[in-house]
Structures are given as C-alpha cells and as structure tokens.
C-alpha cells in the first residue's frame, strides 16, 4: 500500500565529473523498520519477474553483503527515518535516475531521484535587482545549484577582472528542500561602474578556476558634466566678456534639459550648452555651474568662481566694541568691497591721518579716554583707491576721575556740629549718576554729591566718597578731625591698694579715655567745693572728715566732663567716745538709769565694754547699760570702751549720782 511510504528529498541534484553528490533524504515506513535497501541506477521494472532490473550501486541485506561499489556510494540513513546518500566521486555516467528500493516486513517501495552530472563544472548564476542607481546600495547574488560535504568550493566576485573589495556573505544549503551554494555581495555602485563587467567565479578549495558567470552593470545615473570657461582663470575686469561651455561626459538614461545657475539660483533664458556673458559688471561675480537633467534627476557641474575685478568701494569702519572701557582692547576693521582685496589702507582719527597704520585692522591694546572720536579709512587695490566712508564713533567709557571729598564747614569741626561734605570729580563717562559714602550712616543727602551729617559724633574720624557711573571711584578719606570734650572721665584710687584707714596717705587720680584737643585742665570737687586743679588729688594723712563724695572734671577748649561721683570711705577706730546718762547724771534710788556709750567709728562699733570707777569691767557688752532699780551703791564714775575692725577707743569718766528717796530719808 503506497500510502504508507512518505519520502522527502530534492527532485533533481546537479554535479559534475569528479565532484560528489550528497542527497539529503527522509522517509517514513509506517508498518515497521526497513529490512532491505537497494540503490539502482536507471531501474526498469520487469513484469515477467516482478522485479526491478538495473545497475545496483548499493545493496544492504540481512546477511550484510556489500558490493565493491559501496566504497563510492554510501547509504547514510537508518531503518526508519533517514535515507541520506552520498556518491563520491560522481561520474558523468551516474547521470540519470537513482532508484531507492525499500523493503520492510510487509511492504516494498521504489523512490526515484534525478541526478544530473555534467562533464565540466557548470557555471553559477548571477542575479541582479531590476534597476541599479548610482550610490544606492544593491545586493548582487551568485547562485550555484550544488553543495557537497566532500567537495568544498568557493564563489569569488570580480569587477572588470579584479577581485572586489567588498566582503561577500556565502551560505550553503543541504536540506531535503534544496541544495545550493549562494554568495551575496552588498555594493554601492557609482556612475563610473556603468557598463562594467561583474563576474562570479566558481573555484575549488585551492582557488583553481572551475567556471563563472558574468553580467554587465547598467547603472542609472544623473548626467556627469564638465564646465570650461574662457578666460580659463575666470578673472576679468568690469566690461570684459566671458564664455562658459557645458560638456556631458556620461548620462544614463539620456539627458533631457540644460540650465545654468549662479550662486545656486537659476539664470533665466539660458538653456543651451554655452553661456555668453558680455560686458560683465562686478555684480556678475559669483559661482557658476551648469545643470543637466535626465529621468534619474539633475546633474551639476563643478562651480566656476567668476571674479570681476573693481576698485574699492567707499569704506565703512566696524569697531569691536564701542562703547569701550578704558584699559580694554579695541579693534577697528576697515570694510570695503573690492576685487582684488585691498593691499593698503589709510586710517583717520577725527579726520587726521593715523601714521604707520596701513593694515585692514587697527588694534589698540589699552584704550585711553583720548582715543575716543571718529575713525574712518580708505582702501586701495591695484585698480585704484576707494573713497573715505562716514566713519564710526568710538565711545571710551571710564570711571570718574580725580574724585575728592571736600569739607564745606569752617574748621575746626566740633562734636555736635552739622558737617556738610561734597564729592567732586574732574571728568566722567558716562555721567555720574550716584554717590557713595564710607562709612555708612543715617545721614542726609540733600542733593546729589552732598552729604550732611547732623550732630557729628566725636568718633567720626574719616569720611570718603565715591562718584559712580557704571563704576565707582573712591576718593582718599578726608579726616574730619572732630574736636570734643574729654570722654569717659573717672576717679581712680591709686593708693592705698586696699581700704583707706585714717592716717593713710591717699592718692586719687582723674583719668579719661580721650580728648581733642589734647590740652586739658583738671578740677576736683567734694560736695560742690573746689579742692584742686591737678590730675591727682593727694592726702598726706587722711582723716574721717575727708570722707565723702568726690568728682573730678576734665575740660578742654570744647567743654568739660565730670566723672561719676566717687565715694571716699575712711576707716577709723572708735573715737569721741562719751557716756551719756538718762534721765540725767543725778537719779533717785529705785528709779531707772540708762548709760549710753556714744561714739564715732567706721565701720561702726561691733563690741562695747563697760568699766566702773575701779576700772572693773562690768558684765555688759551692749551700747546701753540699764540700771533698774538704781541703788545708791551704783553712784560713781563710769567709762566705756568701743571696738571695731580698726581698733579700740575709750570714753572719759562720767559720774552717776544716786540719791536717797524721800521714803528712805523718812525711815531714817
């Protein structure tokens, strides 16, 4: 049952004498494995014997007998899928039909494959795209219906017999669908390749020529042109004539139209291969070319630069840059249309010729204010001298010059005065628009460039102003030299360094931080009374009476300043002690008597001691000694002693008389 056998392989295989053939083949026998395989050459079915007759190239049987031909022919298949064959070498007489006789346990099949073996290697086939245009990449394909593992070949590309530089990509196919070798070459043809012969050459592994195919390239391209001009250098003077001729060196397909262009713009009514320019003017200077078109597109010739020579035109001056800042660099450029270019220039500053300046550019490395003004120039070439143009204005800007701060007040200035200063300058460009003052203060500027300082401070030492346009120029600071009364006056105790004790030598000094003018006088006062006129107040032996509030005054021609009040404290031992008696020094017995120890001391008495007429100390230590009830025996002389941190003092004796009461007298 034929439906049970399915084969896949190329229908025809091609080779040449001495090469080899590789036959990719697959099959499927559904009823079981292959038991017998015979490869016939041109098999014929014999109806009588019901068998195939023909040359047996290969036989595979159960007993494994293999004919000698099997060395050349190999079955590379298996019992159920693969039926690939190889014939190596292959001969001319192998051409014809190969028959694959397959037998399984129950089925038989004859599969036929065509083999075409030529006497010599057959040529490859070059495939070209339908149209080739210049500079457009195309792929050239060289195809050979041959590939065999045992016989390596190569395909090489030649242009006009010379190997092509471009890298080709070679691919092979040995499949049940197709057997071939292919080489693909990517190539960007130029117009010059038109009509050239391209060859694909088949070579063996050693590079020996086997066969080839050739094609002629038909490269479509725009017209290729050559332009000729008379005179050949294309340099003329105004009024001369010029002829230009356009020649087509190649065009594929043929050209259709001709035109001329100047500086890229088409010239009207110029549609022939010759362009005649009569009595040229300088405006006709420029780049000329001819343009010829075909179906591919327009082609342009190279450009011819026509130079119409003329004397310089009136010149203009360009300044880099104006306004210019003083100290910066400036460049002047003389611009004049001329052909040939000017060879000599004459420069003018404010109408006066600038000596030694003959170049197109004038460079001033450091601009100064006097460089300002009008600059003009004259250009000269072989055809003549141009005219002087209107010129250009150079504006030189600079900070205000010679700025000074001027005090408007009569001198000297005193603390508290209103001071007016002005800011003056010599010149400025651009104009001064504002002023600055140092140091900054809450000061008035009644008008531009004038500063008014109300109630000037003693410590306003210097003032500087700046006049400003785009820049500020500072004046040197001006000293106000403000005069003021002495400041920070104080009393300083020079000696002793510790507390002042009565009898000490004491020195007080009147000190202050500053005074202007420096010449000063001193005054000392105590409780509003003038004590002295020296800077120092000396006490050879201080007494408690000297204690009190002291001030010193320092004056100069501007005014006087007093110190803070300074308290002079004198420490002394208790003095002027006395015993006072209350209600009096005569007291009736039974009543109350109070003795008080009065004293003058600094610091105050801290401890009292009482004594009787026998100098016997009494057990009382307070300022008051209270006797209650007083007895006649209390009569007698008493004294007290006071003690402080400085020392002791004692009182004179004070006598207390205690007399009898009427009751006591009555009892007696």
């Amino acid at each position: 049952d034929s439906s049970k056998w399915v084969f896949e392989h190329p229908e025809t295989l091609y080779a040449w004498e001495g090469a080899c053939v590789w036959i990719p083949c697959t099959y499927r026998a559904l009823d079981g494995d292959l038991e017998s395989f015979i490869l016939f050459h041109n098999p014929e079915y014999n109806k009588n014997t019901s068998k195939f007759d023909g040359t047996r190239l290969y036989e595979s049987t159960k007993d494994g007998k293999v004919p000698s031909e099997q060395k050349r022919v190999q079955f590379l298949g298996d019992k159920n899928k693969n039926c690939t064959l190889s014939i190596h070498p292959v001969h001319l007489n192998d051409s014809g039909q190969l028959g694959l006789r397959m037998e399984s346990k129950t089925e038989k099949w004859m599969e036929r494959i065509h083999l075409n073996v030529s006497e010599r290697p057959f040529p490859p086939h070059i495939q070209l795209p339908p149209e080739i245009q210049e500079s457009q990449e195309v792929t050239l394909t060289c195809l050979l219906n041959f590939s065999c593992y045992g016989y390596p070949i190569q395909l090489q590309w030649l242009l006009e017999g010379v190997p092509m530089r471009q890298a080709a990509v070679t691919s092979t196919s040995l499949t049940i669908k197709s057997v071939f070798t292919r080489s693909e070459l990517k190539f960007s043809p130029q117009w010059s390749h038109h009509g050239k012969i391209v060859t694909c050459q088949l070579q063996d592994a050693d590079g020996k020529f086997l066969s080839n195919d050739t094609v002629q390239l038909n490269v479509k391209h725009t017209p290729k042109l050559e332009i000729k001009v008379t005179p050949s250098d294309a340099i003329v003077r105004e009024g001369d004539s010029v002829t230009m001729t356009c020649e087509v060196s190649s065009s594929n397909p043929e050209y259709t139209t001709v035109s001329w262009l100047k500086d890229g713009t088409s010239l009207k009514k110029q549609n022939t291969f010759t362009l005649n320019l009569r009595e040229v003017t300088k405006d006709q200077s420029g780049k000329y070319c001819c343009q010829v078109s075909n179906d591919v597109g327009p082609g342009r010739s190279e450009e011819v630069f026509l130079q119409v020579q003329y004397a310089p035109e009136p010149s203009t001056v360009q300044i880099l840059h104006s306004p210019a800042v003083e100290g910066s660099q400036v460049e002047f450029l003389c611009m004049s249309l001329a052909n040939p270019l000017p060879t000599n220039y004459t420069w003018y500053h404010n109408g006066k010729e600038m000596q030694g300046r003959t170049e197109e550019k004038v460079h001033i490395p450091k601009i100064l204010p006097w460089h300002a003004g009008t600059y003009s120039c004259v250009a000269e070439n072989i055809l003549g001298t141009g005219q002087r143009g209107p010129g250009a204005e150079l504006d030189v800007q600079y900070p205000p010059k010679k700025v000074t701060t001027v005090i408007q007040n009569p001198m000297p200035i005193r603390e508290g005065d209103t001071v007016t200063l002005s800011c003056n300058y010599n010149s400025s460009n651009p104009s001064v628009t504002r002023y600055e003052w140092k140091p900054h203060g809450a000061w008035e500027e009644p008008s531009l460039g004038v500063l008014k300082i109300q109630n000037v401070g003693w410590d306003n030492t210097t003032i500087a102003c700046a006049a400003c346009n785009s820049w500020c120029s500072w004046a040197s600071p001006v000293a106000l030299n403000v005069q003021y009364a002495p400041r920070d006056v104080r009393v300083r105790k020079i000696k002793p360094l510790s507390e002042i004790h009565s009898g000490n030598s004491v020195s007080l000094q009147c000190d202050f931080s500053s005074s202007h003018p420096k010449e000063v006088q001193f005054f000392w006062e105590k409780n509003g009374r003038l004590l002295g006129k020296e800077s120092q107040l000396n006490f050879d032996s201080i007494s408690p009476e000297d204690a009190g509030s002291y001030s010193c005054w320092v004056n100069n021609s501007i005014g006087q300043t007093a110190s803070k009040a300074w308290t002079l404290e004198v420490l002394y031992a208790p003095r002027r002690l006395r015993v006072s008696m209350s209600p009096g020094d005569q007291v009736m017995e039974g009543k109350s008597a109070t003795l008080t120890c009065e004293s003058d001391a600094n610091p105050p008495v801290s401890h009292y001691t009482w004594f009787d007429w026998n100098n016997q100390s009494l057990p009382y230590h307070s300022q008051k000694l209270r006797l209650e009830p007083v007895k006649v025996q209390h009569s007698g002389a008493y004294w007290c002693q006071g003690t402080n941190s400085v020392g002791k003092g004692r009182s004179p004796l004070s006598t207390l008389t205690v007399y009898y009461s009427p009751e006591t007298i009555g009892r007696r």
């Epitope: 300083r492 000190d511 931080s513 500053s514 009040a565």
Partner: antibody, heavy 119, light 112 residues
C-alpha cells in the same frame, strides 16, 4: 567676708515681668557701683546696666532701654533688677557684679539667678 | 560701642603646657594716664565668672601667678604659663573704659 547673694530661680510666662534681688554684705554698700550681666544658655556674657547705690542713678544698655529698671534699698543693702515684657530669648542666668572703685573691674559676682521664660 | 574679638574660640590644652588667648578691641583702651582698661575673667563650669586680671596686667587677689596679662591699645593677651586641670572653663575679656561695658565672645579651654 564680702559677698553678693541673689534671689532664687524664676519661671515666667511671655509678656510677664521678673524682679531679681542682689543683697550685698561685708562692705559699705553705698561706696561701690553695681552692674547687672546676663548669660543665655550656652552663650557669652551680656552687660545690661549699672546703678549707683549712693544716689540711685542708673545707666542701661541700649538693647534693654524701656524694659529694664534698676533700683536699690540702702536700708537692706539690696539692689534690684526688674525686666518687663519678657520673651523666650530672655531665658538666661542674671548676675549682679560689684565694680571695684579703683579699677572699674567686676571684683565680686553674685551666684546668679536663672530666669526661664516659657509659654 | 567698643567691640572685642577673642581668638581662638576653642582651645584644647595639655596640662603642663603653656596657653594664650588673644583679645582685640575695635578702639584703643589706653587712657590719658596710660592705663589699659581691659579685664580678664574665668567662668568655670557651673560657676559665676571670677576676676583674673584687671587694668590689662594686674592679677586679682588670690589668682595664681601662672596667669598673666599683657598688651596695650587694641591688642591684648592672656597667658597661662603651665596649664592645670582646674583652669578649664570659658575665659572672657571685658573693656572697663566706658559704658556700655562689652565682653569678648569667650574662649573655651578644655583638656586634650
């Protein structure tokens, strides 16, 4: 011995006033000027003003003008510093310091009073 | 007002080594009689400031002689000849020439 003893710590609300006292002992109270200095947390010393205990005259730093009042009571040898319209930045330790009559240096300092101002 | 500028603001020291602090005034503190009204104070951690040097170079009573003050006019220096551990704290200069009294920012001295 000579010493200045200040009143204790105070906590006040913003806008309130505080009155700190400084009691002098061991010397003649009226013979020496008294200054007030404050120190905000982690900051330096800042002078506030001076009072003459003898006559009661004062001089204040520009910054505190109108908010600070310094007074004295000679009977108790005490000076006072009152700061009004308190704000959080017034949180500081406030010191009284005696001015040495010879040199003008602050030879004796109080122990300080912490005033905290918080909402 | 007079502005006092101290430097450095922080001073790490090694015990036994010398140390110095600078104080610069915005105007001269020298008086008519030649006194420089600049004082130095030390504020130890958690304590009130204490007087070290008065009128530029005079040591206050009880201050060790390793402390000394020098300078005149606008530039003053406090020197510690050999730093001891108890000298740590913040040192301030103050001008006593005029009211308002002004202080430097303070220099923090700490042991390395």
């Amino acid at each position: 011995q000579v010493q200045l003893v200040q009143s204790g710590a105070e906590v006040k609300k913003p806008g309130a006033s505080v009155k700190v006292s400084c009691k002098a002992s061991g010397y003649t109270f009226t013979s020496y000027y008294m200054h007030w200095v404050r120190q905000a947390p982690g900051q330096g010393l800042e002078w506030m003003g001076i009072i003459n205990p003898s006559g009661g005259s004062t001089s204040y730093a520009q910054k505190f003008q109108g908010r600070v009042t310094m007074t004295r009571d000679t009977s108790t040898s005490t000076v006072y510093m009152e700061l009004s319209s308190l704000r959080s930045e017034d949180t500081a330790v406030y010191y009284c310091a005696r001015e040495d009559s010879g040199s003008g240096a602050f030879d004796i300092w109080g122990q300080g009073t912490l005033v905290t101002v918080s909402g | 007002e007079i502005v006092l500028t101290q430097s450095p603001l922080s001073l790490p020291v090694t015990p036994g080594e010398p140390a110095s602090i600078s104080c610069r005034s915005s105007r001269s503190l020298l008086s008519y009689h030649g006194y420089n009204y600049l004082d130095w104070y030390l504020q130890k951690p958690g304590q009130s400031p204490q007087l070290l040097i008065f009128v530029g170079s005079n040591r206050a009573p009880g201050v060790p002689d390793r402390f000394s003050g020098s300078g005149s006019g606008t530039d003053f220096t406090l020197n510690i000849s050999r730093v001891e551990a108890e000298d740590v704290g913040v040192y301030y200069c103050m001008q006593s020439l005029q009211t308002p009294r002004t202080f430097g920012q303070g220099t923090k001295v700490e042991i390395k």
